[in-house]
């Protein structure tokens, strides 16, 4: 059992969904779990999140906000063998740029 490389980081806009892949060479009976190292608290034990969503073990986080930030790590286990762990993907949550004060619709400008 071995893991493919995962992206070092993933940038998602506030309110969008984040999709994390856990590529591995295992057969379908592999058990994929996801863990998070909390942003700014890297000495804390990783936090257990739950299983992957599909046979590939994808993690989907809906409607992300700033508190979702952190490093997401997947672990893959076949049978009762020791698990393999990804290096982790850092989730960055991007604030959408504020609308400029003068960003008016055309109808407003012409009044």
């Amino acid at each position: 059992l071995w893991m493919h490389k995962v992206p070092a980081s993933l940038m998602v806009s506030l309110g969008e969904d984040a999709h994390f892949q856990c590529p591995h060479n295992s057969s379908n009976n592999a058990n994929v779990t996801w863990w998070r190292v909390l942003h700014g608290n890297y000495t804390w034990p990783p936090e257990f999140l739950g299983p992957g969503e599909d046979p590939n073990g994808t993690l989907i986080i809906q409607n992300v906000n700033k508190s979702h930030g952190g490093i997401y790590v997947c672990r893959v286990q076949e049978g009762n063998e020791s698990y393999q762990q990804s290096c982790g993907t850092y989730l960055r949550v991007r604030q959408p740029p504020p609308r400029p004060f003068l960003d008016m619709g055309e109808g407003t400008k012409n009044r």
Partner: antibody, heavy 116, light 110 residues
Framework: EVQLLESGGGLVQPGGSLRLSCAAS????????MNWVRQAPGKGLEWVSG????????YYADSVKGRFTISRDNSKNTLYLQMNSLRAEDTAVYYC?????????WGQGTLVTVSS | QSALTQPASVSGSPGQSITISCTGT?????????VSWYQQHPGKAPKLMIY???KRPSGVSNRFSGSKSGNTASLTISGLQAEDEADYYC??????????FGGGTKLTVL
């Protein structure tokens, strides 16, 4: 502070239905797989059902398979358990819980009584 | 999905140490070591005492310790106190989003 607040319990006749809700606050709800655990009067804890973070994966104990349906509304930070064809042996306190690791959270439970 | 096996009851005098065992199969425990121990007082929700086999959450007394060897997990309580009297449950991750609990152990402080 993390809070899980269950509601929807009550008295129902055998064969009837109930829908339990669990409103979550103080945690990144959409990140977590969530679970329902029950405890019959004077008995031990029994895992009932679980659901992945986005709702794509659902899991059931054999004792409730085909009768109970777990779901979640991530826009409302709420977990649900639809219970159909209820039996006397389903009488229990039902807890909503995020299980596993240090971020382990439980509600205070809601009592479901199935009796004629 | 059969329950993990725990002794129905254990007892000890104040100041003594007791150990509660929790036995399952290799598929119950896997290699994740996602074994938790809960304390439950009557009418209350379970309280996490040990996670991942041997780690203690903040706020839990260091009199509580956990270990795991093969297909058996153990909870040890040293320096027993009256407030330790409660029911104790082990719980293990069993893959997917499925979990299995032990049948529970009633601890009596004599």
């Amino acid at each position: 502070e993390v809070q899980l607040l269950e509601s929807g319990g009550g008295l129902v006749q055998p064969g009837g239905s109930l829908r339990l809700s669990c409103a979550a606050s103080g945690l990144t709800f959409t990140s977590y797989a969530m679970n329902w655990v029950r405890q019959a009067p004077g008995k031990g804890l029994e895992w009932v059902s679980g659901i992945s973070g986005s709702g794509g994966g659902t899991y059931y104990a054999d004792s409730v398979k085909g009768r109970f349906t777990i779901s979640r509304d991530n826009s409302k930070n709420t977990l649900y358990l639809q219970m159909n064809s209820l039996r006397a042996e389903d009488t229990a306190v039902y807890y909503c819980a995020k299980l596993g690791g240090w971020s382990d959270y439980w509600g205070q439970g809601t009592l479901v009584t199935v009796s004629s | 999905q059969s329950a993990l096996t725990q002794p129905a009851s254990v007892s000890g005098s104040p100041g003594q140490s007791i150990t509660i065992s929790c036995t399952g199969t290799s598929s119950d425990f896997g290699s994740y070591n996602l074994v938790s121990w809960y304390q439950q007082h009557p009418g209350k929700a379970p309280k996490l005492m040990i996670y991942e086999g041997s780690k203690r959450p903040s706020g839990v007394s260091n009199r509580f310790s956990g270990s795991k060897s093969g297909n058996t997990a153990s909870l040890t309580i040293s320096g027993l106190q009256a407030e330790d009297e409660a029911d104790y449950y082990c719980c293990s991750y069993a893959g997917g989003s499925t979990w299995v609990f032990g049948g529970g152990t009633k601890l009596t402080v004599l």
